[in-house]
């Protein structure tokens, strides 16, 4: 029986060039986290983080994906089109999958402010 | 054309070490994952482990750690794999292979270095 | 270490049959298996990832399915090139592992 639930950022806004911070969260659960897969909006993969093999980027992204904080990701170098959702798949053991959604806007404004809060979704 | 081209054939006495290297071309080397592979004659695959150019992070399979040491210079775009305190449970062909797109698999592989490890 | 179980070890059969491998891992990887083809005295190529996505510039009579545990690959009428060994390989965890191998030859 799957118990747990996925934390994540929510709904999150960022300046253009600058950088966020994409974090899930897994809790009330005391399954074994073996991969964390995050993809975009078009399914596309960004990242993966794997317990044992480390870390994979997707290499069209080496250069501007970082790895961290944590099982978390941090997206560099924003574009406009980087506007729009991600997810963050949990591979457990022995629960199964979990999945969490988190949408970036990414604004042009210099006034744009980084909010980032901890939502369930 | 996405290429690796790795270094000729080794004869070498047990005991001793020896170097082999893989150069790739026709992408970008800092942004793929380079694996290397064992295969013995006639038998199956065995993965070593694989060298991150863009940090030089490296991941190994346990059974080779203190046998084999990867490294890669991105100069060059060359990946390096050292083998050290050879038996003749070392001869085999060695192959070193790009990492896939989407995770730890094998898309572009090298024409493989044989090592034959006699006194 | 994740044991990859690949079957029949050998295989026979003509030009224009369907063949199918099977590859079956003893927990489970979701969908993170590869096949590769390797012919004699050559290097592997990818065929398939992620149990069933189809390598670039493969064609399109192989076709892998499956997850968890259970894995197939499937070749429609067979071509005189499609001969060789097909190995399957796990990518979710360390070590990764292959198959030992089934072996396609020419009835």
């Known amino acids: 029986m799957m118990t747990g639930t996925i934390e994540t950022t929510g709904n999150i806004s960022a300046k253009k060039g600058g950088s966020v911070i994409l974090q899930c969260h897994l809790s009330s659960t005391m399954a074994q986290v073996t991969q964390v897969n995050w993809e975009q909006h078009d399914h596309s993969l960004l990242a993966i983080r794997n317990a044992e093999l480390g870390w994979h980027i997707y290499p069209a992204f080496k250069d501007r994906v970082a790895p961290g904080p944590g099982l978390g990701l941090t997206l560099q170098s924003l574009t406009m089109n980087d506007t729009g959702e991600y997810f963050c798949t949990y591979h457990t053991y022995p629960d199964g999958t979990y999945r969490g959604r988190i949408f970036l806007e990414v604004l042009e404004s210099s006034v744009a402010e980084h909010s980032a809060r901890f939502q369930i979704p | 054309e996405v290429q690796l081209q790795q270094s000729g054939p080794e004869l070498v006495k047990p005991g001793a070490s020896m170097k082999m290297s893989c150069k790739a071309s026709?992408?970008?080397?800092?942004?793929?994952?380079m694996h290397w592979v064992k295969q013995k004659p006639g038998q199956g695959l065995e993965w070593i482990g694989y060298?991150?150019?863009?940090?030089?992070?490296?991941k190994y399979n346990e059974k080779f750690k203190g046998k084999a040491t990867l490294t890669s210079d991105k100069s060059s775009s060359i990946a390096y794999m050292e083998l050290s305190s050879l038996t003749s449970e070392d001869s085999a062909v060695f192959y070193c292979?790009?990492?896939?797109?989407?995770?730890?698999?094998?898309?572009?592989w090298g024409a493989g270095t044989t090592v034959t490890v006699s006194s | 270490d994740i044991q990859m179980t690949q079957s029949p070890a050998s295989l026979s059969a003509s030009v224009g049959e369907t063949v199918t491998f099977t590859c079956r891992t003893n927990?489970?990887?979701?969908?993170?298996l590869t096949w590769y083809q390797q012919k004699q005295g050559k290097s592997p190529q990818v065929l398939v990832y992620?149990?069933?996505t189809l390598a670039e510039g493969v064609p399109s009579r192989f076709s892998g399915s499956g997850s968890g545990t259970q894995f197939s690959l499937k070749i429609n009428s067979l071509q005189p090139e499609d001969f060789g060994s097909y190995f399957c390989?796990?990518?979710?965890?360390?070590?990764?592992?292959f198959g030992a191998g089934t072996k396609l030859e020419l009835k």
């Open positions: 026709g992408y970008k080397f800092t942004s793929y994952v």
């Open positions: 927990e489970n990887i979701y969908s993170y």
């Open positions: 390989q796990h990518h979710f965890g360390n070590p990764l592992t």
């Open positions: 060298i991150d150019p863009y940090n030089d992070g490296s």
């Open positions: 992620n149990a069933k």
């Open positions: 292979a790009r990492g896939g797109s989407r995770g730890w698999y094998f898309d572009v």
